[in-house]
Amino acid sequence: GSTAIGMKETAAAKFERQHMDSPDLGTGGGSGIEGRGSMGYRGSELDTPKDLQVSETAETSLTLLWKTPLAKFDRYRLNYSLPTGQWVGVQLPRNTTSYVLRGLEPGQEYNVLLTAEKGRHKSKPARVKASTAKEPEIGNLNVSDITPESFNLSWMATDGIFETFTIEIIDSNRLLETVEYNISGAERTAHISGLPPSTDFIVYLSGLAPSIRTKTISATATTEALPLLENLTISDINPYGFTVSWMASENAFDSFLVTVVDSGKLLDPQEFTLSGTQRKLELRGLITGIGYEVMVSGFTQGHQTKPLRAEIVTAMGSPKEVIFSDITENSATVSWRAPTAQVESFRITYVPITGGTPSMVTVDGTKTQTRLVKLIPGVEYLVSIIAMKGFEESEPVSGSFTTASGLNDIFEAQKIEWHEGTHHHHHH
């Protein structure tokens, strides 16, 4: 016999070595080679069948094709291995050029040997190795990333088999229409969206392979409850109030209750009832520079939601009524009215209106005036005053004045002081 060369002898080579020269193999109950043995193919003039190939693979069958050899012969013998290691032999008429191996196991490799026979002589075998298609399988349907209106699906499936997958989404109470999706057989995930919140669903997945529909697998999913009331936002903060806004599900509420309490709990809570369609409330008439807690809750048929909460500090009040007096060539007094809320300090910034480096002076929060010095004669100055408390600053209040330019202007400057800043004084 012939021995395969190399480290490992192939199953086909081993089969040839053991059987191709041996007489009387017998059928062996269908597991051996059909018919009688032969004298072998050494020195034979028989040509090997040409271009043996597998033209089609299926789960339980393989289709073989080949070309007729030139030399005359009587018949073909086709041998193929089983997963158990046994061989099956089939005798075929000499005009045969194709054959279908049937009754095979899915996803298994098969060795095929095809020889031409004449009398007791055999050609060298043509060889081919091929695997049957894997059986289409799907499993492990998993639901993840659940939101109020969507979820993700993932699953496992035999690769390269399925043309499409069909996903059916059915709500458990059968109140909604069944939704069906058809997606590519290459996919292993799907995002399902546009679902109602707080709803139980059954998900069915099936795969479509040529002429085969697999068994359907299923999973259950429940969309999350919609956050009925959320995103409490405070905006437009000013010394006397702020704007409260929130988000809520459409038609979920009959009314909203907005409660405003000062952080020190010194004042009575203020309550505002709004219709269920409103999403905003502008609050005015609050105290400047103090903390407030805002609570928003919704009512549905008398039931109250747990409130959304936010804490806020109203903006610092700005100084008022800037007055300039005692204006000289190089100095002036600026005074103002303090805001109602207590402040730590005032910052006064002044700069020539034509430009230049601003000067700054900070005074204690109890003061309501200061003297500006080292000014340039005959120059108009822009003055800005802000109140400060900790890191918080009020909106600025501004005004302008012009320093005296010479002796003639001193009388005018004194007149400004006498007339409470009605001359050369602008509120900006």
Epitope: P197, S198, A225, L226, P227, L228, L229, S249, A252, D254, S255, L257, F299, T300, Q301, G302, H303, Q304, T305, K306
Partner: antibody
Framework: EVQLLESGGGLVQPGGSLRLSCAAS????????MSWVRQAPGKGLEWVSA????????YYADSVKGRFTISKDNSKNTLYLQMNSLRAEDTAVYYC???????????WGQGTLVTVSS | SSELTQDPAVSVALGQTVRVTCQGD??????ASWYQQKPGQAPVLVIY???NRPSGIPDRFSGSSSGNTASLTITGAQAEDEADYYC??????????FGGGTKLTVL
């Protein structure tokens, strides 16, 4: 004083119909949402249906959806529950209840017994 | 699920404090309401909102809430407090939901 008085209960065969009424007094009926709640013998409370003050919006438990209809006649200060295709499991005492804007089911009637049996 | 879960039965010695609890998804968003029902009578509202009592309800009744759990506390239980207690809330589809009820026995 708020008063709610149910009527219309009785014995009915499976598949039959019944109409319950709830006469209301002591409050502005048209301003308040109303509900029907039932209690099977020896069992807990089960909400059945609700209707808005104007009567424009209605809500139903899944167990009665498509079979029961809630309505109210604000001119007569009366709440109704039309019950069709009655089943044995609908046997219960049926209560009507008032809802205030900030207080749920704050007043209840004394109930009327509905028995569904052949 | 939109159901509310209650312990079927609770007992308390006369004058002692008892807590009846209620669990459910809707209680994450809404406060529970509590109803007292004595045999052969209609239910009576005893607590609603964060911790509000209708007029005529003794101040020994109080309510509290945390996460998906609501509690009704009776401080110094009296014989006349023996009754069934039902928690109640509402879900996102405006359906009222009730707990299965807790039978309170005063010993």
């Amino acid at each position: 004083e708020v008063q709610l008085l149910e009527s219309g209960g009785g014995l009915v065969q499976p598949g039959g119909s019944l109409r319950l009424s709830c006469a209301a007094s002591g409050f502005t009926f048209s301003s308040y949402a109303m509900s029907w709640v039932r209690q099977a013998p020896g069992k807990g409370l089960e909400w059945v249906s609700a209707i808005s003050g104007s009567g424009g919006s209605t809500y139903y438990a899944d167990s009665v959806k498509g079979r029961f209809t809630i309505s109210k006649d604000n001119s007569k200060n009366t709440l109704y529950l039309q019950m069709n295709s009655l089943r044995a499991e609908d046997t219960a005492v049926y209560y009507c209840a008032k809802t205030s804007p900030r207080v749920p089911l704050d007043y209840w009637g004394q109930g009327t017994l509905v028995t569904v049996s052949s | 699920s939109s159901e509310l879960t209650q312990d079927p039965a609770v007992s308390v010695a006369l004058g002692q404090t008892v807590r009846v609890t209620c669990q459910g998804d809707s209680l994450r968003s809404y406060y529970a309401s509590w109803y007292q029902q004595k045999p052969g009578q209609a239910p009576v509202l005893v607590i609603y909102g964060k911790n509000n009592r209708p007029s005529g309800i003794p101040d020994r009744f109080s309510g509290s809430s945390s996460g998906n759990t609501a509690s009704l506390t009776i401080t110094g239980a009296q014989a006349e407090d023996e009754a069934d207690y039902y928690c109640n809330s509402i879900n996102s589809t405006r359906n009222e939901v009730f707990g299965g009820g807790t039978k309170l026995t005063v010993l």
